[in-house]
Every structure is written in C-alpha cells, then in structure tokens.
C-alpha cells in the first residue's frame, strides 16, 4: 500500500507513517517508529497541555502574582491553565489578565452605568437632566432630583448634574 500523506484526527505523520498524538495532559517522551508506539507521560505538578499534541515539554501554569493584584479564579489542571482574576476593587488590564488596575470612580456629575468586574472597568455616564451625583464613586448611580412637590414644598434652588434641588416651604399669602 502507498504510504499515507495525511493522518486521522489525533494522529500525526512521521517518516511516512501515522502515529498517535499525546492526549491533553500528557507530553511526548518518545516518537513512534516503524516498530514502536508513541510514548507519552503525564505533565508534572503545575504543568499542562490543553490539546492533542506532540510537545516534548508541558507548559507551566500561569502564576497569579498577588503583587500585581492577581488571585486564582480557577486552579489549573494537567489539561487547563490557571485562570487569574483581580482582587476586589481591581480589574484586569488585558484579556490575558497579566496585571490589574484599580477600578475607576465616576466623578461628581457622572454616575455608574455598569459596575466594574474582575475583567472590566467601571463604565460612567453623565447624569442627565433631573439626575445628579455629588460624589466620586465606583458604585453610585445618578440619583433623581428630589421632588419638592411630593413633599408639599417648592424648589428654592435648582438642581444641577452635581447637586440636588433645594426645597423650601411655599410662601403663604398674607391677608
């Protein structure tokens, strides 16, 4: 028969023959030959390989460096890498989450549209008319102005995007 030019899934071509790849979590220690099978061994502690492979070395698990604000979100296995996330109040600077930065706060006049997560920063929005924020915060939304009418009061000072309205008593007409 003709020697193969392509192999099945989970195999690789070597010296005109198809050999088994190593399963995830294992590395290649000896290629197959005309007379011998592929030999694979499990990755060591703190190592992984996540695909069918012919790698001679396993990859090291990612280290979640607390000095960079990182912590382990999901411990790695022989088949998966460790997933890092950021400490409370911090978020990743990239998709790979190699370091963290402090969550941004929304300045007065702006409210939190979306609270930050371990992987995304705070999203702020300007307070629209009828709403205000007088604090710098990573959690506070824009608050609606106080409704003086419902308290049987009148507006003494108009509100802004940074301040609430000031209500006062209605002027009584004297007889």
């Amino acid at each position: 028969p003709e020697p193969p030019t392509a192999c099945r899934e989970k195999q690789y071509l070597i010296n005109s023959q198809c050999c088994s790849l190593c399963q995830p979590g294992q590395k290649l220690v000896s290629d197959c030959t005309e007379f011998t099978e592929t030999e694979c061994l499990p990755c060591g502690e703190s190592e992984f390989l996540d695909t069918w492979n012919r790698e001679t070395h396993c990859h090291q698990h990612k280290y979640c460096d607390p000095n960079l604000g990182l912590r382990v979100q999901q411990k790695g296995t022989s088949e998966t890498d460790t997933i890092c996330t950021c400490e409370e109040g911090w978020h990743c600077t990239s998709e790979a989450c190699e370091s963290c930065v402090l969550h941004r706060s929304c300045s007065p006049g702006f409210g939190v549209k979306q609270i930050a997560t371990g992987v995304s920063d705070t999203i702020c929005e300007p307070c629209p008319v009828g709403f205000f924020s007088n604090v710098s915060s990573a959690f506070e939304k824009c608050h609606p102005w106080t409704s003086c009418e419902t308290k049987d009061l009148v507006v003494q000072q108009a509100g802004t995007n940074k301040t609430d309205v000031v209500c006062g008593p209605q002027d009584r007409l004297r007889a």
Partner: antibody
C-alpha cells in the same frame, strides 16, 4: 534501512574546536530527533542534547551548554556537533543517535582525542 | 537531574544462568526506561524500551520489568554472545540520564 554515518576520528589540540558530522539515510531526516551522546574511555554514557531537524529546535543538557553547538543541514540530511574549548576531559567517543527518548538507531561513533 | 544507579559494576555469570541487572532511579520515571547492550568497540544497541517492551529483533530471553524507581533487565538463559556492558537510561525528564553500566563477565 536507517543508517547514521559519522565522520572519522579527530586529534585536536587543547583549547581548539572540532566539528563532527552524522549523515542520516533510510528515513525522512526532518522527522526524527538527532541526539548526541558522549562516552569517555571505559566509562558510561552522557546525553549532550538533541536537535529536531524539522524545525531546527535544540535542547541541550545544561552541562554541555556553551560547549556543544548542534546544527543540521537539511539539504544533505546531516547533523553536526561543534565542540569548543576542548580539554582532556573531552577526549571521548561521540555518538549520534536518532529518535526521541529511546535511541533505536546509533552512528558508529567518532573518537575525539584532545592532546596537550 | 535524575540519577540512574546500577549498583553492580560487574557481574560474573555462566552460560545457561538466569541473570538480573538492576537499575534504580533517584525519583519516579514512571516507565520511561530503556536498556542498551554495548559490546567493545561497538555502538549501544536498544534492547528494551518503555521499561518492559522488547525492541524488534531482540531475543525473547531478554525481559525488562519495573516502574517508578526500580527496574531490572533479566536474561533468562545466559548465552556467550550476551557478554557485554548493559546500560539503563531514563527519558522521563530532561536531561536524559544513563546508569553507570554493568559488565557481564564469565566466571
């Protein structure tokens, strides 16, 4: 059938360099790792490192880093090992052997003698 | 580095004897062990790989056994052509390392 043909014996001066070769035949040269192994007279075997001709990637035993340089010439299916700054401790037979991990095929060996 | 220890440098045998050569690894190498035979002036020859698999063309009187740290090469019935040096090798981790060798001699 697989054959690994090594270059002939070398007599070199201390401090000099020597380049030995290993010509492969009988298989697809780029598919199998080529290893180099040292054997001093009447002694055991020491693994120097491997080169994968398909990619040129090299893995060397720390003990030989800086002293052994492994290369290949794909056009002639030949692997080379350059040994530099030789001392009397480097007087030995050097073998090339193919395959990863276990060594199914061996060259006949190259005797390197380092003289003062 | 993993140290492979062949405690017997020499072994005296007689044709027809059952001979066992041992090899101990300084840490587990699972089953990634090969055995080689080397005769004077020749290259080593692969006998056993993966601790217990006989390489093609190797007579069935040669048997490999063991896993983890303790391994053995057994010659069921010693023949005169088996007089040689025998080396174990681990290929579980880098650098690959060999035992110091055991020389079989005639009593």
């Amino acid at each position: 059938q697989v054959q690994l043909q090594q270059s002939g014996p070398e007599l070199v001066k201390s401090g000099a360099s020597v380049k030995i070769s290993c010509k492969a035949s009988g298989y697809t040269f780029t598919d199998y790792y080529i290893n180099w192994v040292k054997q001093r007279p009447g002694q055991g075997l020491e693994w120097i490192g491997w080169i994968f001709p398909g990619s040129g990637s090299v893995y060397c035993n720390e003990q030989f880093k800086g002293q052994a340089t492994l290369t290949v010439d794909r056009s002639s299916s030949t692997a080379y090992m350059l040994l530099s700054s030789l001392t009397s401790e480097d007087s030995a037979v050097y073998f090339c052997a193919s395959s990863l991990g276990k060594f199914a095929y061996w060259g006949q060996g190259t005797l390197v003698t380092v003289s003062a | 580095d993993i140290v492979m220890t062949q405690s017997q440098k020499f072994m005296s045998t007689t044709v027809g004897d059952r001979v066992s050569i041992t090899c101990k690894a300084s840490q587990s190498v699972v089953t990634a062990v090969a055995w080689y035979q080397q005769k004077p002036g020749q290259s080593p020859k692969l006998l056993i790989y993966s601790a217990s698999n006989r390489y093609t063309g190797v007579p069935d009187r040669f048997t490999g056994s063991g896993s983890g740290t303790d391994f053995a090469l057994t010659i069921r019935t010693m023949q005169s052509e088996d007089l040689a040096d025998y080396f174990c090798q681990q290929y579980s981790s880098y650098p690959y390392t060999f035992g110091g060798g055991t020389k079989l001699e005639i009593k």
